[in-house]
Interface confidence: low
Amino acid sequence: MGRARDAILDALENLSGDELKKFKMKLLTVQLREGYGRIPRGALLQMDAIDLTDKLVSYYLESYGLELTMTVLRDMGLQELAEQLQTTKEESGAVAAAASVPAQSTARTGHFVDQHRQALIARVTEVDGVLDALHGSVLTEGQYQAVRAETTSQDKMRKLFSFVPSWNLTCKDSLLQALKEIHPYLVMDLEQS
């Protein structure tokens, strides 16, 4: 059901700063289904699109998280984005019954980045160059600094990979592109392995 997570992230990433702020404010007051708690205000207001997607999925699971996102977007007048989510919901069969199933981390497994996680953690040495390529487009300032703060290359890569489960395909492609530019022979080696 990773499609719902990706769809939520895509929708939130396409909100401007103004819209994302409004989305959060509306999330604080929107009527919730019985049994569901509210994301704490303090934490919510600090989140970027990726963090917020994670929270929506962990608090409300993918099915209800998708539905809630659609509701808030419609309430903001962003029908077009809400309709895109509606399409995803219909295509993935995200029915309300799924809300009783525990949330699962369903990151794509076929991508180069997922397939070669261990090798990349062990063998990427120019981590700062990779970070600079991802800074702003894939990594938030906080995430960028958190990875930079680690001391060894391996720890930096482990920290970087801790953010990967919430990435969409475009983010993973960006990491692959950065690796191709900075460690072309490593990528070639892994692709042939």
């Epitope: 396409n14 700063g17 103004d18 007048g77 029908q79 077009e80 487009s137």
Partner: antibody
Amino acid sequence: EVQLQQSGAELVRPGSSVKMTCKTSGYSFSSYGMSWVKQRPGQGLEWIGYIYVGNGYTEYNEKFKGKATLTSDTSSSTVYMDFRSLTSEDSAIYFCARLNRGRALDFWGQGTTLTVSS
Amino acid sequence: DIVLTQSPASLAVSLGQRATISCRASQSVSTSGHSYMHWYQQKPRQSPKLLIHFASNLESGVPARFTGSGSGTDFTLNIHPVEEEDAATYYCQHSWDLPYTFGGGTKLEIK
């Protein structure tokens, strides 16, 4: 064809109010927002605010809060801007413009010229 | 408020040459999905006309000689080859945060 037809020029006294209209046609009125923009003679553009006509949701530039009020009437596909406590600084051309998804202004009215003079 | 600084304030370009207009924002107006920067053309005694939305997406019916680029804080509108009918004032506008603001405008004159 999308069209935004604005009301005619206004000559009013300082301290008074005026209501400008923007009648729309050629698209689904409730699916879009409408913005208003001010342009003083020979000067640049200044965003006043917007209204989502589907649910009446409004946002204003702080500078125009208390000065402008945006409303809409779905039955006539018309958006209104009430402008009050007028001074000579309010003399300008006022445009209504449709908001697209990215909050760009993709269709504009022809403008209403407001002159505030005693 | 986000301040948009356009440069130059005016420029004169020969017919068929390239016109380049810059717009710098006081803070980033981009996500990984989009850049919330738009470009307009306004001719004397006319309403502004949207040329480009999301920094680089050409509006329907706008000639391909208009191109937009940039992300983050630095954006550019290029017109090439310039034609007589392009004489106008060009404005950038962001829709990143409230209030939305416009650049001061760049007046293009055709030599």
